[in-house]
Interface confidence: low
Amino acid sequence: MGNSCYNIVATLLLVLNFERTRSLQDPCSNCPAGTFCDNNRNQICSPCPPNSFSSAGGQRTCDICRQCKGVFRTRKECSSTSNAECDCTPGFHCLGAGCSMCEQDCKQGQELTKKGCKDCCFGTFNDQKRGICRPWTNCSLDGKSVLVNGTKERDVVCGPSPADLSPGASSVTPPAPAREPGHSPQIISFFLALTSTALLFLLFFLTLRFSVVKRGRKKLLYIFKQPFMRPVQTTQEEDGCSCRFPEEEEGGCEL
């Protein structure tokens, strides 16, 4: 016990001695944040001048405060120990690390181009004030039907197909990732769905018979409680179309 106590004291003395030696060698290391080591005044710690800061100790100069001018506005004032932080004036949003740029907001249903805000083309949407127009989800690619039509501001809402009408299934599914438009004929899709539903029900009742016989009533209730759904991704693809499809004939776009 005494030995370990001695070790601690010795270590502390070593550290303190090292710090003292270091400060004797480099008096600037004593200068705290908010000050700088002034070489013109025998390395005295001088406070940072107005509109400058030092966020760490031992600095030989203070950094100039960032000025939030023009389209930038001050989110946090500069202090002697930390830089100012800017955001953008209303109607603009930040871009880049530390809000290095301000980009113009557009309305929902629009995207920003070099010539300003432009409406999303037919078949695309933007539900934010920033970013680009993205294609509507193609429900048929997931075997679903369109429950609610898309607009310039909103994606389509995919509704159930006959195959989704099994017990416990959710009736409206979030859109899957946006994909290129498909052209599968609706009638073929419908009959395929109908056939697969019939087969599913057949398999389902066969399974039930064996379940009742083998595992009893508890297991049967458990099967009924499970929704027959596969996981659906809800993330949208980041980039989508811009108003530049030669085949588009809808109004409101600059082609």
């Epitope: 023009g70 690390a97 530390g98 290095s100 740029m101 181009t113 811009s242 530049r244």
Partner: antibody
């Protein structure tokens, strides 16, 4: 009319550094980004990095990170590109270019180019 | 990084020809694409931005189309002044990258 005027040709030894300037006139210097793009003899264009002069935020391509420093002097409307530890493969024409829409954008105005030759 | 591949590398054509240059991106870049013209010893010149918007002062015989990964620059009727090298550039994501260039030469 926006103009970007670059400094003259340079001949450098391997291992040394070069600093190229790009002076802008005829526009609000602070409100757009200045990028540096290089072109080796008979080769294509390669983006090196850029700066937003309004407060000096620079952005570099990974390939040049640690070897290139891009700065801007608002008082003289001049951007600078310094490339260190030069090697023979850095022999190229270095262009400054302006983009006004966003940081990553098309370049609507270009400097005339500065030829940097690295040779022992 | 997003790779930009131009084809063809060299194109021989005559004055009055309709010329098409293709640029393919290794991943979708929406419409964030520009086309430049460069003549020997000169800086590149912006022709098209946002895939299809014509830069002011550029003749209307130049046009751009495409979205996603496939883009095209078309010169409807090639003029003597159009013999040059053409580059595409994506500015969808960091770092912005250029195609290797297409040289349009006299047949």
């Amino acid at each position: 009319q926006v103009q970007l005027v670059q400094s003259g040709a340079e001949v450098k030894k391997p291992g040394s550094s070069v600093k190229v300037s790009c002076k802008a006139s005829g526009g609000t210097f602070s409100s757009y980004a200045i990028s540096w793009v290089r072109q080796a003899p008979g080769q294509g264009l390669e983006w090196m990095g850029g700066i937003i002069p309004i407060f000096g935020t620079a952005n570099y391509a990974q390939k040049f990170q640690g070897r290139v420093t891009i700065t801007a002097d608002k008082s003289t409307s001049t951007a600078y590109m310094e490339l260190s530890s030069l090697r023979s493969e850095d022999t190229a024409v270095y262009y400054c270019a302006r983009s006004e829409f966003r940081f990553y954008a098309d370049f609507d105005y270009w400097g005339q180019g500065t030829t940097v030759t690295v040779s022992s | 990084d997003i790779q930009m591949t131009q084809s063809p590398s060299t194109l021989s054509a005559s004055v009055g020809d309709r010329v098409t240059i293709t640029c393919r991106a290794s991943q979708s870049i929406s419409s964030w694409l520009a086309w430049y013209q460069q003549k020997p010893g000169k800086a590149p010149k912006l022709l098209i931005y946002d895939a299809s918007s014509l830069e002011s002062g550029v003749p209307s015989r130049f046009s751009g189309s495409g979205s996603g990964t496939e883009f095209t620059l078309t010169i409807s009727s090639l003029q003597p002044d159009d013999f040059a090298t053409y580059y595409c550039q994506q500015y969808h994501s960091y770092p912005q990258t250029f195609g290797q260039g297409t040289k349009v030469e006299i047949k």
